[in-house]
């Protein structure tokens, strides 16, 4: 004869176990069903009916099958330095990121609890590391022969061009300036020589991301600037 | 962008009923909930109840439990409050106004209210 | 139910004083369901501070919030010819969702 299909709720055999997506109540002493994801426990299970369920209420969720009395509170909408990546549902909590240009200072289980602008270097200083998601720029003073000119969170040091003749040498926050012959360049053999002084230098640029659209009815709060740090500065 | 018009002005007799609508526009009714609150003439604001457009559950204040029946109509995007046995004290401004979900019951657009007058 | 009480009802005020509203729960209402609305006559209200502090775009910055468990304000650092109109507080911790009775910031 084929097993006996158990409806919920029923007493589990000895020492075994509630299937998948029930739980054993311990004052029914029985199996019963969990709720899903964007639902909770209205009404307990007893030993002749079984779990109640009710959808959460606004700006509460659950994510997993469960038998919990409330559901969870949704996360603060986010600040003005950060995205909404994720909505607050039924179903997920509300997930927020730093938008470009912040970097995450204080993180939490899913996405950002604190962002923080990302420091920018200030003339002199080029950047060393650039910033993640999670870490700060890195500035570094400009090496001999090499310069910024910005206040840039991007920007690294660059090569001064170099003159024939110098009218005025370069320094770590400014390029050198030739007279009106023309510069030369360190050159690979064979490479063209272009009569107009022409930087060497590499625009560094970090990609950054997409900014998320939170929704339409985003409310926006305002958040100071991190203050400057070594070889950079707060503007 | 986002709006909700209100039908006009209504003028009925005491025990008549009464049927205000909202009709929404610039968003997805998805995800948001919509509020009925009324205001008599000269007196503050009262919430009367809310519903969810996409699943039709409905709240109310115990003390509207009787009096007040909402329900929408996602097909054209229009919520409705029904008053039954309409009273001299009903005579009120009556607004509609929706809330995010996830945004803990701020409601951020309202109606321009509609007022409905009870008198013989 | 929650009852929440404003004071005080009116007040009267000159353009460019500072003015606050405070909203009292009867019982512990969170931070995140706590908004402010303005209204002024003839008008639909304004959602015009959400979950305690938070202003949302279009509201002068002179206007602020804060509070938490029972006692919560409403603060105009520099009134405004705009600003004279009706307050209310509402709570949505807790249904039935209640409003306080309003404040009416007149002109003196």
């Known amino acids: 004869l084929p097993a006996q299909v158990a409806f919920t709720p029923y007493a589990p055999e000895p020492g075994g176990t509630c299937r998948l997506r029930e739980y054993y109540d311990q004052t029914a002493q029985m199996c019963c069903s969990k709720c899903p994801p964007g639902q909770h426990a209205k009404v307990f299970c007893t030993k002749t009916s079984d779990t109640v369920c009710d959808s959460c209420e606004d700006s509460t969720y659950t994510q997993l099958w469960n038998w919990v009395p409330e559901c969870l509170s949704c996360g603060s909408r986010c600040s003005s330095d950060q995205v909404e990546t994720q909505a607050c549902t039924r179903e997920q909590n509300r997930i927020c990121t730093c938008r470009p240009g912040w970097y995450c200072a204080l993180s939490k289980q899913e996405g950002c609890r604190l962002c923080a602008q990302l420091r920018k270097c200030r003339p002199g200083f080029g950047v060393a590391r650039p910033g993640t998601e999670t870490s700060d720029v890195v500035c570094k003073p400009c090496a001999p022969g090499t310069f910024s000119n910005t206040t840039s969170s991007t920007d690294i040091c660059r090569p001064h061009q170099i003159c024939h003749v110098v009218a005025i040498p370069g320094n770590a926050s400014m390029d050198a300036v030739c007279t009106s012959t023309s510069p030369t360049r360190s050159m690979a053999p064979g490479a063209v020589h272009l009569p107009q002084p022409v930087s060497t230098r590499s625009q560094h640029t970090q990609p950054t991301p997409a900014p998320s659209t939170a929704p339409g009815t985003s409310f926006l709060l305002p958040v100071g600037p991190s203050p400057p740090a070594e070889g950079s500065t707060g503007d | 962008q986002v709006q909700l018009v209100q039908s006009g002005s209504e003028l009925k007799k005491p025990g008549a009923s009464v049927k205000v609508s909202c009709k929404a526009s610039g968003f997805n009714n998805k995800d948001i909930y919509m509020h009925w609150v009324r205001q008599a003439p000269g007196q503050g604001l009262e919430w009367m109840g809310r519903i969810d457009p996409a699943t039709g559950n409905t709240k109310h204040d115990p003390k509207f439990q009787d009096k007040a029946v909402l329900s929408s109509d996602t097909s054209v995007s229009t919520a409705y409050l029904q008053i039954s046995s309409l009273k001299a004290e009903d005579t009120a401004v009556y607004y509609c106004a929706r809330s995010p979900y996830g945004d803990f019951g701020a409601m951020d657009y309202w109606g321009q209210g509609t007022l409905v007058t009870v008198s013989s | 139910d929650i009852q929440m009480t404003q004071s005080p009802s009116s007040l009267s005020a000159s353009v460019g004083d500072r003015v606050t509203i405070t909203c009292t729960a009867s019982s512990s209402v969170s931070s995140n369901y706590l908004h402010w609305y303005q209204q002024k006559p003839g008008k639909a209200p304004k959602l015009w501070i959400y979950?305690?502090?938070n202003l949302p775009s279009g509201v002068p910055s002179r206007f602020s919030g804060s509070g938490s468990g029972t006692d919560f304000t409403l603060t105009i650092s520099s009134l405004q010819p705009e600003d004279f109109a009706t307050y209310y507080c509402h709570q949505y911790h807790r249904s039935p969702w209640t409003f306080g009775q309003g404040t009416k910031v007149e002109i003196k």
């Open positions: 979950s305690t502090s």
